[in-house]
């Protein structure tokens, strides 16, 4: 006996379309495009159904239902907005993802996405995956007047990437992006199998405050060309974040330099180092403390650490000097890992030129140069870890 | 015909995240339907977890969607869940399925939420 | 969430008998509903889809039957390797849901 006439679902059509359908007969049912076959919550990528010979179909027939691609995820540090219509989700709504803004940037396209017949939110450029939000480097609520003067204490925003670094010895380091810490190797050697023993803590001026955000470190990684006990070359780590930070005025990454930065580090250009490290009187300081000081021409700073106690060598082609022939202007122990920072003229932000690595036993000593790992020099070596990890 | 089979580890300490994956042979993950996540605490009844179609679309149950991720490899033909955050309330067996017109189950594997 | 609710949660009845397991779905599910047969230790075997359509392979005593709210699992004869627990299961919206199970004995 014939099979009952199928009624095609709406959005749907039925093939073959036969005058009849008898015993081991079978149609098939295609949706419109932006349509798709569900049967109540299950998707199905195709339907074909079969006379029986009892004379009904194998199974029911199912739904063609609008393209739902659902609530659009949430985009970390930025915000979605409905454009279509308020919760609309079907095929081809349209929505609009934007960051925060002053503190994140969009990175992949412009935020606008459309539901297609696929069911996924896709992108003007066909990207299925979200646009990221990506933390603006370099912002500080100052600004170089160009000129030397030191010792002065740090205001709230001045130095936003600053981050204390304990658990062990006092060091410092500087955000990079929201979720990885630059600092100097020999800061952190001492835990580079232990990374969970670093303390990190950012968003305060002053030391032993406890208002502060805590960040715990997932891992170290120094560099393999640093040698512990060995001299400072190649004196740099990363240190990665166990969670990402939230940016804001008082949190806010350093940017790295871009290829053009020499120009901003030429002898004499000045930079600024600050930290929480031994001050003139000898004790670490309590409040975050900076210093601008000018770059020292790199064959004066190499004939300064030639002679004795300091072993032939010791400053390298991986290292910069700063301070002041005079002495007076330096950065000390404690500082280690913090940055030696420039402003980009042309971009208005502010970059890490150096890390505070190591100098004269006696710091702020004249004739004596504060020795900086030279960051521009590992570009390579900070994007590769940041990208694989 | 297809068949699943579980896999993972069969004991998870508190917080941390669960893995399974379900490996299809005898078929693709991609040809048709949805592919299920459903589980059973010791003594109790079943409860679906979530599934990934065909065209790698998901869905999952809101009581969990916070801490579920199920994802799809389809140069393995396999569809992998994780539960973050697990307490010992998520122990439980674990199965992989296809539902509806096909029934097709993986054995089961039983998850251990314990320190 | 749409709950499906089962009666009995356990029965008992003797080889032979006609034996219905009822399914109350909080909302309407169409006749977006499957039942599942488990035995002890094992997998959930799926017996009946779409309320009404038996899964190949299914011996023809069981039967499935409704649509909307109320649903009746039916097995028209109970064999001896029958005794299991019967779930109902409702596809037709997020999250999938199951009964609480019925658990079926014979005296």
């Known amino acids: 006996q014939p099979c009952p006439y199928p009624m095609a679902p709406p959005n749907g059509h039925v093939s073959p379309v036969q005058a009849k359908y008898i015993l081991k007969d079978s149609f098939s049912i295609f949706c419109e495009t932006g349509y798709e076959l569900l049967q109540g919550h299950l998707p199905l990528k195709s339907f074909t159904a079969v006379c029986q010979k009892d004379g009904s179909w194998d199974r029911p027939m199912p739904a063609c239902s609008i393209v739902d691609c659902g609530p659009p995820d949430d985009l970390p540090s930025g915000r979605v907005e409905y454009i279509t219509g308020p919760g609309v989700t079907t095929y081809k709504a349209v929505i609009q993802y934007s960051c925060e803004e002053t503190f994140y940037t969009m990175k992949v396209n412009d935020g606008k996405y459309v539901c297609e017949a696929d069911g996924f939110w896709t992108s003007s450029k066909g990207e299925k995956s979200l646009p990221v939000c990506e933390p603006v480097c370099g912002l500080s609520a100052r600004t170089t007047g160009g000129r030397i003067y030191g010792g002065q204490k740090a205001k709230p925003g001045d130095f936003p990437w600053q981050v204390l670094i304990l658990g062990g010895t006092t060091a410092a380091g500087a955000l990079l992006y929201d979720n990885w810490v630059l600092t100097a190797a020999h800061a952190v050697y001492e835990q580079k199998h232990d990374a969970s023993a670093l303390d990190i803590r950012m968003g305060t001026l002053k030391r032993l405050s406890p208002h502060y955000t805590q960040a715990w470190s997932e891992a170290v990684f120094i560099h393999e060309g640093y040698t512990h006990d060995a001299g400072f070359d190649n004196d740099i780590a990363l240190i990665k974040l166990n969670n990402k930070v939230v940016i804001n005025s008082n949190i806010t990454p350093i940017c790295l330099p871009r290829k053009e930065a020499e120009s901003f580090m030429r002898t004499d250009d000045i930079g600024t180092a600050s930290g929480w490290g031994l001050t003139q009187r000898g004790f670490l300081a309590r409040n975050l403390m900076y210093v601008d000081i000018p770059i020292v021409d790199h064959q004066k700073c190499t004939a300064a650490y030639e002679k004795p106690p300091y072993p032939r060598g010791s400053v390298t082609a991986n290292m910069l000097c700063a301070g002041l022939e005079s002495g007076g202007k330096d950065s000390c122990r404690g500082d280690s890992g913090g940055a030696l920072v420039f402003l980009d003229s042309e971009t208005e932000r502010w970059f890490v030129g150096g890390i505070v690595s190591w100098g004269s036993m006696n710091c702020g000593e004249a004739g004596q140069y504060g020795v900086y790992t030279k960051v521009i020099n590992y570009i390579p070596w900070i994007e590769n870890i940041i990208s694989d990890f | 015909e297809v068949q699943l089979q579980e896999s993972g580890p069969g004991l998870v300490k508190p917080s941390q995240t669960l893995s399974l994956t379900c490996t299809v042979s005898?078929?693709?993950?991609?040809?048709?339907?949805?592919w299920n996540w459903i589980r059973q605490p010791p003594g109790k009844g079943l409860e679906w977890i979530g599934y990934i179609s065909y065209s790698g679309r998901t869905s999952y149950n809101p009581s969990l969607k916070s801490r579920v991720t199920i994802s799809v490899d389809t140069s393995k033909n396999q569809f992998s869940l994780k539960l973050s955050s697990v307490t010992a309330a998520d122990t439980a067996v674990y199965y992989c399925?296809?539902?509806?017109?096909?029934?097709?189950w993986g054995q089961g594997t039983t998850v251990t939420v314990s320190s | 969430d749409i709950q499906m609710t089962q009666s009995p949660s356990s029965l008992s009845a003797s080889v032979g008998d006609r034996v219905t397991i009822t399914c109350k779905a909080s909302?309407?599910?169409?006749?977006?509903v499957a039942w599942y047969q488990q035995k002890p230790g094992k997998v959930p075997k799926a017996l009946i889809y779409?309320?009404?359509y038996r899964y190949s392979g299914v011996p023809s005593r069981f039967s499935g039957s409704g649509s909307g709210t109320d649903f009746t699992l039916t097995i028209s004869s109970l064999q001896p390797e029958d005794v299991a627990t019967y779930y109902c299961q409702q596809y037709n919206s997020n999250p999938l849901t199951f009964g609480q199970g019925t658990k079926l004995e014979i005296k």
């Open positions: 005898g078929g693709s993950i991609s040809s048709d339907y949805a």
């Open positions: 909302q309407n599910v169409d006749t977006n």
């Open positions: 779409s309320a009404s």
């Open positions: 399925a296809v539902l509806y017109a096909l029934d097709y």
